[in-house]
């Protein structure tokens, strides 16, 4: 075979968002008959030669970026996409509210606001049961980006987290759930209650207003300051896609 072997997948089960003291398993999956796996924690000089890592109780020090590769004969594969293992519950939960309220008419607008008592500059908003809410942004989003009308498919349960860009893998506990109800329509949203929570968006500003724009499941932000979308590495290829949106300088 010419060229490197195809990359394996790396996933965290049951989720890459892990409450402190809860268990998680990291699993690297390559093709059948792999000779050797290598799992590593980036920026730590830590490795193992096995495909599976069981963490019996999540700790702050175990959060971070992981990746894996495999060897067949003398050939090494391309590395997997990075998996970002996040410890949650490190800080007190933020509060999540809806403006003007959690009940919105179909075709109306709604703003979700996540607030924290800490000076955090990052927020993550999740919709329960949404396995892959993100698509890649098609443009740079700025404060003037229009708020798109709400449809029935966006009814559901939302939670947010807050964290600092200085420690991007140590997150707060989740906010209390916010039930968003879209009225004036009989369409029932599709929900997968057995799925782990999936990311909807991550936002800048210590008290950021999160304007949820419902177009093709792409959630964007609007605040009083200009926001620049800056996608980083995606999450586990086997899990939901996740993009980061951080305030531009």
């Amino acid at each position: 075979q010419s060229g490197p072997l195809p990359k394996p997948s790396l996933q965290a089960l049951p989720s890459s968002l892990v409450p402190l003291e809860k268990p998680v398993t990291l699993r690297c999956q390559g093709p059948p008959g792999v000779d050797l796996y290598r799992l590593e924690k980036l920026s730590s000089s830590r490795y193992q030669d096995q495909a599976v890592l069981f963490i019996p109780a999540m700790k702050r020090s175990l959060a971070g970026r992981y990746r894996c590769s495999y060897q067949n004969g003398s050939l090494w594969s391309l590395p997997s996409d990075q998996l970002e293992l996040v410890a949650t519950g490190v800080f007190a939960k933020p509060s999540l509210s809806a403006q003007p309220g959690p009940a919105v008419s179909s075709g109306g607008d709604v703003t979700l606001q996540c607030q924290t008592r800490y000076g955090f500059d990052q927020f993550a908003l999740y919709k329960e049961g949404d396995p892959a809410p993100y698509k890649n942004p098609e443009r740079w989003y700025r404060a003037s980006f229009p708020i798109i009308t709400v449809t029935a498919a966006h009814s559901g349960t939302y939670r947010c987290y807050s964290f600092s860009s200085r420690d991007p893998y140590l997150w707060s506990a989740p906010s209390d759930p916010l039930e968003l109800v879209v009225t004036g329509t009989s369409v029932t949203p599709s929900r997968l209650p057995t799925e782990p929570p999936s990311p909807v968006a991550e936002f800048s500003e210590a008290t950021a207003e999160l304007t949820v724009s419902f177009t093709n499941e792409v959630f964007t932000t609007e605040t009083s300051r200009s926001i620049t979308a800056s996608p980083k590495e995606s999450d586990s290829p086997a899990g939901p896609a996740r993009q980061y949106y951080t305030k531009g300088n």
């Epitope: 730590s44 000089s45 830590r46 490795y47 096995q50 890592l53 963490i55 019996p56 109780a57 175990l62």
Partner: nanobody
Framework: QVQLQESGGGLVQPGGSLRLSCAAS????????MGWFHQAPGKEREFLAG????????YYADSVRGRFTISRDNAKNTVSLQMNSLNPEDTAVYYC????????????????????WGRGTQVTVSS
């Protein structure tokens, strides 16, 4: 901290085998990643092999993978290094070390992560 004592070193011919053992005392042994390092004359101390707290996961330096095997017995508080196909470049002082990381940590190749060290055992590979 864990107290560590290596044994099993000696003189061996090229192509031969040796089994090193490390006896540990201290309550934290079963919660520590254990590693073997060696230091050849005039060189830096170098990671060879490590094993997780449970023994389920291991990691080897490329120079010894396939020739050396690390294992541990938590009931006896020992960690061993089986060394096969030895060559003169393996001549060094071999050290056992403990890294008190949380269960679920990967194996560190960095000396500074290990806070307990034995005094070492000499291995000489020569004909």
């Amino acid at each position: 901290q864990v107290q560590l004592q290596e044994s099993g070193g000696g003189l061996v011919q090229p192509g031969g085998s040796l089994r090193l053992s490390c006896a540990a005392s201290g309550r934290t042994f079963t919660r520590s990643i254990m590693g073997w390092f060696h230091q050849a004359p005039g060189k830096e101390r170098e990671f060879l092999a490590g094993i997780s707290w449970s023994g389920a996961n291991t990691y080897y330096a490329d120079s010894v993978r396939g020739r050396f095997t690390i294992s541990r017995d938590n009931a006896k508080n020992t960690v061993s290094l089986q060394m096969n196909s030895l060559n003169p470049e393996d001549t060094a002082v071999y050290y056992c070390a403990a890294d008190p990381s949380h269960p679920g940590s990967l194996i560190s190749t960095r000396r500074s992560d290990y806070d307990s060290w034995g005094r070492g055992t000499q291995v000489t590979v020569s004909s």
